[in-house]
């Protein structure tokens, strides 16, 4: 080993990573809201739609106050990875009716990937435990029909919207604890 020498600062630190994650999450929330609205305009939903393979909502308004950094980041990363895979699946499985939304779905997937990478970087820099993201609990087969893929899209975008909404609140709260 040579004599002690300083290292130049890298591009970001954990606090900046968290700021960046908040901005990316907000941006993704706006995209998801807009895409969900487009979906409702083009393909009006007949009530709420569910997909068994989607993660259950992690947080409620009542539990926000008791959030801990490791739990929030781990759960958020696992849930967003699931949504990432569902958007991937939707793009592959989408029938002709959903092809008009392909550019928006592609952009959404790319933004999700960026956010996932930022969250993982934050967890690495903090040295928090990183659970391996599971594959979707239910294997994602092709939708039964064109209407099936539309209902799936409603469910995926609706669930992602709710997840990102609590994520923004949770991350903002965590900023005060880092």
């Amino acid at each position: 080993p040579g004599p002690p020498a300083g290292s130049p600062r890298v591009s970001s630190d954990p606090r900046a990573d968290l700021d960046s994650a908040v901005l990316l999450t907000r941006s993704l929330l706006a995209d998801t809201r807009q895409l969900a609205a487009q979906m409702r305009d083009k393909f009006p939903a007949d009530g709420d739609h569910n997909l068994d393979s989607l993660p259950t909502l992690a947080m409620s308004a009542g539990t926000l106050g008791s959030l801990q950094l490791p739990g929030v980041l781990t759960r958020l990363r696992v849930d967003l990875m699931s949504y990432f895979r569902h958007v991937q699946w939707l793009r592959r499985a989408a029938g002709p009716s959903l092809k008009t939304l392909e550019p928006e779905l592609g952009a959404l997937q790319a933004r999700l990937e960026r956010l996932l990478r930022r969250l993982q970087l934050l967890m690495s820099r903090l040295a928090l435990p990183q659970a391996a993201p599971d594959q979707p609990a239910v294997p994602l087969g092709p939708p039964a029909s064109a209407w099936g893929s539309i209902r799936a899209a409603h469910a995926i975008l609706g669930g992602l919207h709710l997840t990102l909404d609590w994520a923004v609140r949770g991350l903002l709260l965590l900023k005060t604890r880092l």
């Epitope: 600062r9 890298v10 990478r117 970087l121 690495s124 820099r125 928090l128 391996a132």
Partner: antibody, heavy 114, light 111 residues
Framework: EVQLLESGGGLVQPGGSLRLSCAAS????????MHWVRQAPGKGLEWVAV????????YYADSVKGRFTISRDNSKNTLYLQMNSLRAEDTAVYYC???????WGQGTLVTVSS | QSVLTQPPSASGTPGQRVTISCSGS?????????VHWYQQLPGTAPKLLIY???ERPSGVPDRFSGSKSGTSASLAISGLRSEDEADYYC???????????FGGGTKLTVL
């Protein structure tokens, strides 16, 4: 400028103990997870242990589990590695590293030999 | 035996482009964990070269680039220079260890 300065290395007999320290400056130490990584002479890098930013999580490589203890004092911006029951195969340069690791110290040599 | 596999050596002439690969398993690269690359010049400490698969820290020339696909990652160095002669290591988080794992290192020789 980020600085990580290791100390405490030296020659020790098999079965002996050493405590390494790493003094950090130039960054918010309490916001970073910290690692110890070692490199045996002429060999590659081997991760040894990690401690989370607040000290609540600690993980160890199988090769040192039960013998080494990682700790930190955020008020002193200092990382520690307590090494017990040292073996010849623990001979290496020990690096203190922060974050991904993003930053590395220059290392301190630990020689275990009779 | 390293958990991440790298070729032990690589070489190229000045100006050339060289690529170093890094392959992993289901508990690290394959599990969507990001890959980081380090450069270790002779007699010095490792230095972060690429993080999060493809991001460059400030001060790292854009001749260095990283990418990841599936269970493997790669580091590309274009416009090779004599000062690039060093050992290069890939690293990724490993869920089975709850810590980072390193590749065995690749010794790059500039001919």
């Amino acid at each position: 400028e980020v600085q990580l300065l290791e100390s405490g290395g030296g020659l020790v007999q098999p079965g002996g103990s050493l405590r390494l320290s790493c003094a950090a400056s130039g960054f918010t130490f309490s916001s970073y997870g910290m690692h110890w990584v070692r490199q045996a002479p002429g060999k590659g890098l081997e991760w040894v242990a990690v401690i989370s930013y607040d000290g609540s999580y600690k993980y160890y490589a199988d090769s040192v589990k039960g013998r080494f203890t990682i700790s930190r004092d955020n008020s002193k911006n200092t990382l520690y590695l307590q090494m017990n029951s040292l073996r010849a195969e623990d001979t290496a340069v020990y690096y203190c590293a922060a974050g991904v690791p993003d930053y590395w110290g220059q290392g301190t040599l630990v020689t275990v030999s009779s | 035996q390293s958990v991440l596999t790298q070729p032990p050596s690589a070489s190229g002439t000045p100006g050339q482009r060289v690529t170093i690969s890094c392959s992993g398993s289901s508990s690290n690269i394959w599990s969507d964990y990001d890959v980081h690359w380090y450069q270790q010049l002779p007699g010095t400490a490792p230095k972060l070269l690429i993080y999060s698969n493809e991001e460059r820290p400030s001060g790292v020339p854009d001749r260095f680039s990283g990418s990841k696909s599936g269970t493997s990652a790669s580091l590309a160095i274009s416009g090779l220079r004599s000062e690039d002669e060093a050992d290069y290591y890939c690293a990724a988080w490993d869920s089975s260890l709850s810590g980072p794992v390193f590749g065995g290192g690749t010794k790059l020789t500039v001919l």
